[in-house]
């Protein structure tokens, strides 16, 4: 009985036209929504003048239904036992599982003035900057609807630089109409245990933003692992939002609508300074924001944001350093709310829930000649919005799941 | 060693434009701010405007804004400006400068060209 | 546009003696102030930039103080090679303004 259902579930799980794992894998039957919380800036003058610390507050949930279109250019190579394939990106608004519209106003730091000031760093040119931003009447903060931080607006000070610059600015601009990609994955032929790994991205095994083994891209995408998942296994998988490759541990044993799951989840081990742990010290890239690679909780990833000084890190600076918080007000961190978890249906591999949690931030460093960030004291990380990705399988394709894979091992 | 070297005296006639250059060695040319500045005889100094060869990006004094033009050649290392429709009044020795603006000092004009004397003269 | 008064024109000191030049600023311009020194034939040589910062290989002599809008350049004890023109620039925003000079004689 045993051997008959692992034959059968490594036929279904391998990525080529006519096994159940395909169909789901080309186009994901579960419905995937993107809820976001923006950091409202309650006291912009006072930062801005006084170097005081930065008072937020979230309003949210805005929710997007994403990840609805299915993979393209899905490209098998039977030479090397591979699927390539792109991911097409794609939004669109839920207005019924969200507390506003898009047309929502908030106090967000001004993106082009904090990146352009940390991006150009020889004073002449901030000197030139500081004209184009006075002219612009521009400021530290800005007001800028959902739809424009989220998607992207022409910035009045970036259409004044006298020389070729994006003038749009977006924190995932552009987002509609691109795709995520070239992703090659093993498609588990000739070795079930590697199916979904991918083997490169954007046709290279490294992303080239990292020194190491932090460059290495790891594992599958998430959506699915290898078959016959153990707890004790440590799941690598790669995100591109993160630019990076991370891991989760197991955590407990959750019963999925009837179908018994493994929750592994993204342990604080992960985000840890590499003084706490050693492996984390090729994603330390500088050592002055991050206080001699002792700060932890958000991670660099300018490199991968042409220079843009973005950090990741776990909502409300989750698993983050107390210095990273301090200075801001209004943040209350809960594992509960603000972790990363994927729940894996072990026999499969595949990911039947999971829900994917991640802030953006925006570094902001004073400046001399820059009159807007002249008055500042110190470095902020300003937590611009925290994101929650869910999907859960549906009632349906959990009965069918039941009916074909659990119950019958069962 | 940085070193910046001008182009000659230029003798040029009313209304006329001249070009003059600046070739520099000894250190990453794109890394370095160039400024013009201009010294008429026995005066003090007058900031024209520089440019960042990284990109290209200028700043004029608002004096010279019609009067001159900041340019770069990047593969060969030299920096040029342009002056147009002089007058006596433009007559004077035209410095090349550059800085370096990276770290907590923040030196202007470290470095200085020769100078290059432009008559302006029927 | 920040205007830098220079004072004074001229200066005519004994060897071994203080000297001072004064530059006052029309804006605060905090402690952007550079100072520099011009010799005969020569083009100018900074010697002192911003933040009172005195430039590597540059005398011990010669020092800065100031912040806001009024700054003092000084040379504590003159030497006869300190005979030059001295120029102030302010460089806290744009145009970049030179003060008009002083002519640092010797008596």
């Known amino acids: 009985g045993d051997l008959l259902i692992q034959k059968t579930i490594k036929k279904q799980v391998v990525l080529e036209e006519g096994t159940i794992a395909f169909k789901n894998w080309v186009k994901t039957g579960t419905e995937v929504y993107r809820q976001f919380w923006i950091f409202d800036v309650q006291n912009p003058q006072e930062v801005m003048m006084n170097s005081s610390n930065i008072q937020v507050k979230q309003r949210g949930p805005y929710t997007y239904r994403v990840r609805f279109l299915a993979k393209e250019n899905v490209t098998q190579d039977a030479e090397d036992n591979t699927v390539s394939f792109l991911q097409p990106n794609g939004a669109i608004f839920e207005p019924s599982l969200s507390v506003g519209t898009e047309a929502d106003n908030f106090t967000v730091l001004n993106l082009a003035v904090a990146a352009a000031s940390h991006i150009y760093q020889n004073q002449f040119v901030q000197m030139i900057l500081n004209s184009l931003i006075n002219k612009s009447k521009s400021s530290m903060f800005q007001v800028r609807t959902l739809r424009e931080l989220l998607w992207g607006y022409r910035d009045p000070f970036l259409s004044l630089v006298p020389y070729p610059v994006t003038t749009t600015v977006g924190l995932f601009y552009p987002y509609n109409n691109t795709a995520d990609g070239v992703y090659k994955v093993f498609n588990g032929k000739d070795n079930i245990s590697k199916v979904a790994i991918i083997d490169t991205y954007k046709g290279k095994r490294n992303l080239s933003y990292w020194e190491s083994h932090c460059d290495m891209i790891n594992g599958t995408d998430a959506a699915s692992f290898p078959p016959f998942v153990e707890k004790s296994q440590v799941l690598q998988f790669f995100s591109s939002d993160i630019c990076r490759s991370i891991y989760a541990v197991f955590e407990s044993d959750v019963n999925l609508k009837g179908i018994p799951v493994y929750r592994f989840v993204l342990p604080s081990k992960a985000f840890a300074s590499p003084v706490e742990n050693p492996d984390n010290y090729c994603f330390c890239t500088e050592k002055i924001i991050s206080k001699n690679c002792t700060s932890y909780g958000v991670l660099d990833i300018s490199k991968c944001k042409e220079g843009r000084p973005v950090y990741i890190s776990l909502p409300h600076f989750l698993y983050a350093s107390p210095d990273v918080s301090e200075p801001i007000d209004g943040l209350n961190p809960n594992e509960e709310e603000h972790r990363t978890y994927l729940d894996i249906e072990p026999i499969t591999g595949f990911t039947l829930q999971f829900a994917k949690r991640l802030q953006v931030n925006l570094l902001v460093k004073p400046s001399e000649k820059i009159q807007v960030l002249k008055n500042l004291k110190r470095n902020y990380i300003v937590p611009i919005l925290w994101l929650n990705e869910t999907g859960t399988i549906g009632d349906e394709k959990a009965n069918m799941f039941r009916s074909q894979v659990t119950g019958k091992i069962n | 060693e940085v070193q910046l070297q001008q182009s000659g005296p230029e003798l040029v006639k009313p209304g006329a434009s001249v070009k003059i250059s600046c070739k520099t060695s000894?250190?990453?040319?794109?890394?370095?701010?160039m400024h013009w500045v201009k010294q008429s005889h026995g005066k003090s100094l007058e900031w024209i405007g520089g440019?960042?060869?990284?990109?290209?990006?200028?700043a004029y004094n608002q004096k010279f804004k019609n009067k001159a033009t900041l340019t770069v050649d990047i593969s060969s290392n030299t920096a040029f400006m342009e002056f147009r429709s002089l007058t006596s009044e433009d007559s004077a020795v035209y410095y090349c400068?550059?800085?370096?603006?990276?770290?907590?000092?923040?030196?202007?004009?470290?470095?200085w060209g020769q100078g290059t004397l432009v008559t302006v003269s029927a | 546009e920040t205007t830098v008064t220079q004072s004074p024109a001229s200066l005519s000191m004994a060897i071994g003696e203080k000297v001072t030049i004064r530059c006052i600023t029309s804006?605060?311009?905090?402690?952007?102030m550079n100072w520099y020194q011009q010799k005969p034939g020569e083009p100018p040589k900074l010697l002192i930039s911003?933040?009172?910062t005195l430039r590597p290989g540059v005398p011990s002599r010669f020092s800065s103080s100031g912040y806001g809008t009024d700054f003092v350049f000084t040379i504590e004890n003159m030497l006869s090679e300190d005979v030059a023109d001295y120029y102030c620039l302010q460089s806290d925003n744009l145009p970049l303004t030179f003060g008009a000079g002083t002519k640092l004689e010797l008596k």
């Open positions: 804006t605060d311009i905090d402690d952007d």
């Open positions: 400068a550059s800085d370096y603006f990276y770290g907590d000092a923040n030196p202007w004009f470290a470095y």
């Open positions: 911003e933040g009172n």
């Open positions: 000894g250190y990453t040319f794109t890394e370095y701010t």
């Open positions: 440019i960042n060869p990284y990109n290209g990006g200028t």
